[in-house]
């Protein structure tokens, strides 16, 4: 997260870190005791999932292995459409005040809605600085029409844009798959942005979760 702030401790109990060994690979969101939602471009053979802590590599955090993941069948590595994936945990999460599932959206929130995005991604760009604490940024949803002025035909129908006019605050490498939460519901998963990160008026781009609720529910049901 560029130009963000340290999240209030425990305020994001659904936030998970997908680790490759002990190293951050991507963010993710707990949606069920067995399931984590993340970006399709975060796909790996297996994952170490850290839950219940705002500190990356926290020894006291829950760590659960995951060996199965299900990318959206329409995901394209070229255009990054349908950048969404479900990761099935090998064992169920122990829910607590520090570990909770996020609420999936009932509807798509409108442009102008205030949201918070979080992650352990780099706080500087192009040179990288990975924080140990979970970082947050407050952004607003931007209409597709406005966002297309910047990204033209690169913006797919199920991509969502967010940012703050003239501000550098944005997502970056390592934040991928993490949550954009608006009015206590999951509206976006961090997908991509311009590089170097934090260029004013280049919105962050997210997968619009409200358009995938049916796929999420059906995939979890199929692979119970």
């Amino acid at each position: 997260i560029i130009d963000g702030y340290k999240c209030k401790e425990g305020s994001h109990p659904w936030q998970v870190a997908l680790l490759k060994g002990n190293q951050l690979h991507c963010g993710g969101v707990l949606v069920d005791k067995y399931w984590v939602l993340t970006a399709a471009h975060c796909k790996m053979g297996q994952y170490q999932v850290q839950l219940g802590s705002d500190k990356i590599g926290d020894q006291s955090a829950q760590k659960i292995k995951a060996t199965k993941s299900f990318r959206h069948p329409g995901y394209s590595t070229k255009t990054h459409v349908n950048d969404i994936m479900l990761v099935r945990l090998d064992e169920p999460v122990k829910m607590s005040s520090k570990v909770e599932a996020v609420q999936l959206p009932e509807h798509c929130e409108p442009p102008g809605t205030s949201c918070t995005v979080s992650g352990w991604g780099t706080t500087t760009s192009p040179d990288v600085t990975f924080p140990s604490d979970l970082m947050c940024s407050d952004v607003k949803l931007i209409s597709s029409r406005e966002c297309k002025k910047v990204y033209k035909d690169l913006l797919g129908k199920t991509m969502l844009c967010a940012g703050i006019p003239d501000s550098k605050t944005n997502t970056c490498n390592g934040d991928s798959g993490g949550p954009l939460v608006c009015n206590d519901t999951l509206q976006g998963l961090v997908s991509w942005g311009t590089y170097p990160c934090g260029q004013p008026n280049d919105p962050g781009v997210y997968t619009q979760v409200c358009k995938y609720k049916r796929w999420v529910m059906e995939t979890m049901k199929t692979h119970r």
């Epitope: 690979h25 991604g121 192009p126 910047v150 942005g193 260029q199």
Partner: antibody
């Protein structure tokens, strides 16, 4: 394979404008900055500026500010460089070159591997 | 603006000899953002070295780069006939600057 193909040679009169195109193929056009470099006869390489094809954001060398315009059309994977108010000392070979990443995806940081792909060059002659 | 100064302007050597080309920056350059290019008459530049010391794909191991801060070096361990050309250093972070070039000619 990855390549950049530029438009053909141009002969222009002083005061006119020239627009050079650079068509990319073999890679995701929007994923990398496009830079423009020129080389006057018998001289070294001179950087003119760059465009981020994803956002259209430009960076121009101070020397060319106000005279150069870089644009792109992502639907046809093509970048353009227009130079106005041409003078005889603008006679040069103009190159497009693929630069560093213009977008980020994924978890890790990027390594920029240098300008690994260049166009064949477009000769622009300014003469009355 | 970072100014890159290359020396010597011309290097006269025979095939088989070692060539050492210098590039000095007016202020510190991150070694992650320094590259070397080779250019032959009538051709576009060709990337040799990026990140000060990493060889680009397909570049023979007789080419090596070193240095940090303000002083960088390109070394060609044994000159082959096809190596006689002009060499440019470049910094890219994110605006580009090129050095004036060093011509390596046959003695």
């Amino acid at each position: 394979q990855v390549q950049l193909v530029q438009s053909g040679a141009e002969v222009k009169k002083p005061g006119a404008s020239v627009k050079v195109s650079c068509k990319a193929s073999g890679y995701t056009f929007a994923g990398y900055d496009m830079h423009w470099v020129r080389q006057a006869p018998g001289q070294g390489l001179e950087w003119m500026g760059s465009i981020n094809p994803t956002s259209g954001r430009t960076n121009y060398a101070q020397k060319f500010q106000g005279r150069v315009t870089m644009t792109r059309d992502t639907s046809i994977s093509t970048a353009y460089m227009e130079l106005s108010r041409l003078r005889s000392d603008d006679t040069a070979v103009y190159y497009c070159a693929r630069g560093g990443p213009s977008t980020w995806y994924g978890g890790s940081a990027y390594t920029y591997y240098g300008a690994d792909v260049w166009g064949q060059g477009t000769t622009v002659t300014v003469s009355s | 603006e970072i100014v890159l100064t290359q020396s010597p302007g011309t290097l006269s050597l025979s095939p088989g000899e070692r060539a050492t080309l210098s590039c000095r920056a007016s202020q510190s350059v991150s070694s992650d953002y320094l590259a070397w290019y080779q250019q032959k008459p009538g051709q576009a530049p060709r990337l040799l070295i990026y990140g000060a010391s990493s060889r680009a794909t397909g570049i023979p191991d007789r080419f090596s780069g070193s240095g940090s801060g303000t002083d960088f070096t390109l070394t060609i361990s044994r000159l082959e006939p096809e190596d006689f050309a002009v060499y440019y250093c470049q910094q890219y972070a994110p605006l580009w600057t090129f050095g004036g070039g060093t011509k390596v000619e046959i003695k």
